[in-house]
Amino acid sequence: GCLTQLYENAFFRGGDVASMYTPNAQYCQMRCTFHPRCLLFSFLPASSINDMEKRFGCFLKDSVTGTLPKVHRTGAVSGHSLKQCGHQISACHRDIYKGVDMRGVNFNVSKVSSVEECQKRCTSNIRCQFFSYATQTFHKAEYRNNCLLKYSPGGTPTAIKVLSNVESGFSLKPCALSEIGCHMNIFQHLAFSDVDVARVLTPDAFVCRTICTYHPNCLFFTFYTNVWKIESQRNVCLLKTSESGTPSSSTPQENTISGYSLLTCKRTLPEPCHSKIYPGVDFGGEELNVTFVKGVNVCQETCTKMIRCQFFTYSLLPEDCKEEKCKCFLRLSMDGSPTRIAYGTQGSSGYSLRLCNTGDNSVCTTKTSTRIVGGTNSSWGEWPWQVSLQVKLTAQRHLCGGSLIGHQWVLTAAHCFDGLPLQDVWRIYSGILNLSDITKDTPFSQIKEIIIHQNYKVSEGNHDIALIKLQAPLNYTEFQKPICLPSKGDTSTIYTNCWVTGWGFSKEKGEIQNILQKVNIPLVTNEECQKRYQDYKITQRMVCAGYKEGGKDACKGDSGGPLVCKHNGMWRLVGITSWGEGCARREQPGVYTKVAEYMDWILEKTQSSDGKAQMQSPA
């Protein structure tokens, strides 16, 4: 299953399959997730080691048993790949690292006014993988405001150095935020020239394209079909690059197919997995296990559940079957692709779905009334769980926020439905940033069921929580995916990085905002909060957040939206925007429904509604 916990001061011994430099443990974990053989990783921050060569070292590891012995190492961070972790699988990494220079091939230098502008330039340059920016206080005046665009053979820095007044980060192309746009066209009977960066075997051109998309240096590809004249070269997928970023030439060639990486697509990237099953095809590779199962789909599920399995072949040969079950060969290779592809066999083959980010049809958890006042504009994909709950009567308007917690589930505040309990009048918009982008053609979700907490009473602040079941499940994308829920009764975690988001009023007597707003707000203890609200009872099922001096808060129209906190690199839904005295007033924190206190209720309702378990447990 999915394991998300990180081990502080621990280093996995042995099992090394690759090593690289990464700026933090989260990026190291992402590289592990996308490496075909990596199950575990260990990361050495600069503070954990004196050896300059090993600083920022990210060590990717494999293990036949799925685990390795941990040795104590002060400052080291270790953890698991996020394979099998559904919507948490993403190659998108937005963080900017201050005081760090990520080294690579510098191929472009320009003057820009901010690190954000530098990141944008990198994202909009086809060859840029990461960048460094010298701030206005950099010690050498001639380098100030320099934006260096970089690449490397592996897509990660060739070295990382601690350097004052330098900020570094990665291209946001994997976040589907590139302005370049992409070529969706595939060209039959055409071969591209230029430099081959890798060679893999794939059953069709689509798999070849997806592998190219997620390969750090692939910009375009040529695939030799199963009809290619030279048998030994059939099904070869050549991943390519060039200095210019485009093919320098193409040659008409029967039985070849060429195309481009889709990494520069805006708003939508292909999933990093291949779900199609290929009948009459055998995938060769190293044998991991052989099991008898009923049907090729069960074989694929078995492969997906066995974390080291990369692909499979389900044999229908009479000697491989007994009763209704046949042999399911679970296989792997060094690069994650079959070492041999044979056609016209009595087998059906396919790939593990361990990197599919759709996950199962569940809500996500972890084991271990109201623009935002004083906020700033959010950017695309920053808060992909945020939804807008709108009511369509004569006109249509935004009333509340909500949080996507599963393919078919939204969590919001019960008071959003005061006087409007009719599910037919509601429209739920997900994957949006600007309310003005909503037109009559914008897709929306309708409500199948509104589940208001049984103890909620109108005009009271208690149990202000409601679940919405959508009529149809939503697909996950970089702009529309769920927020993980905390564990039941989560009281031990100290959250220091919390944010509230919404389209609500920017001042008490304001109006709904167009661009989704965000504000960073510290949590306040319940004791402190109770002192500020002596006329109300602040219960343990509430959580408060705000600045003593006020100025930043949720407001009308943000209700039902999320209070999220980042812990160990993972966002969790800590609260639901509920109520407060005015907005952003001095010594009047916002009050939120504490989600951890309602985990039993959430699980009960999301499970009983379908009659089957809806929980997915990444840890």
Partner: antibody, heavy 119, light 107 residues
């Protein structure tokens, strides 16, 4: 130039049999997956059967499974469809088609042969 | 089995019109989608493969888009020879299935 030419259609009584042929030219037939697709009069397209290049793997729509058999003779560049236990609902124009290699679908079609099942 | 739902089933348009036909799959089929044109008494002809790629010899006024479950065939400026029936087809899994067809008629 790729060409596919079907033959063997005609009028047959329910329960009867027919063998359709598709002669291929203009490409290396032995390397390609080949398909049969049919179209009932005034209706849409329906996939019937497929066969891999070596003939070692075949697939059928549920509606014809157990009654129809697809085969090929690579030395003669010919695809066949043996149709037994024919029913009135098998009445259709039958097309043979070549696999769109590496992508799926059908890039070349024959002109079709009409099969009428009627008493 | 994957169901392919095409809409509209028929439409009337004039020469020069922009025509859009949609196709929806009952489950995600990635980009494994093809479009065909069929004229009365003729075999179908491949127009678009891989959801958006134009088959060789097909006029550029035809274009395809979409991925996952929702796909579109667009004829930017309808010509007299474009009056025909159009079918979408998924090649994601067997049984290979077609949409019900869209008949484009002269207004």
């Amino acid at each position: 130039e790729v060409q596919l030419l079907e033959s063997g259609g005609g009028l047959v009584q329910p329960g009867g049999s027919l063998r359709l042929s598709c002669a291929a030219s203009g490409f290396t037939f032995s390397r390609y997956i080949m398909w049969w697709v049919r179209q009932a009069p005034g209706k849409g397209l329906e996939w019937v059967s497929g066969i891999y290049s070596s003939g070692g793997y075949t697939q059928y729509a549920d509606s014809v499974k157990g009654r129809f058999t697809i085969s090929r003779d690579n030395s003669k560049n010919t695809l066949y469809l043996q149709m037994n236990s024919l029913r009135a609902e098998d009445t259709a124009m039958y097309y043979c088609a070549r696999e769109l290699e590496g992508l799926g679908g059908f890039d070349y079609w024959g002109q079709g042969t009409l099969v009428t099942v009627s008493s | 089995d994957i169901q392919m739902t095409q809409s509209p089933s028929s439409l009337s348009a004039s020469v020069g019109d922009r025509v859009t036909i949609t196709c929806r799959a009952s489950q995600s089929i990635s980009s494994y989608l093809n479009w065909y044109q069929q004229k009365p008494g003729k075999a179908p002809k491949l127009l678009i493969y891989a959801a958006s790629s134009l088959q060789s010899g097909v006029p550029s006024r035809f274009s395809g888009s979409g991925s996952g479950t929702d796909f579109t065939l667009t004829i930017s400026s309808l010509q007299p020879e474009d009056f025909a029936t159009y079918y979408c087809q998924q090649s994601y899994s067997t049984p290979l299935t077609f949409g019900g067809g869209t008949k484009v008629e002269i207004k």
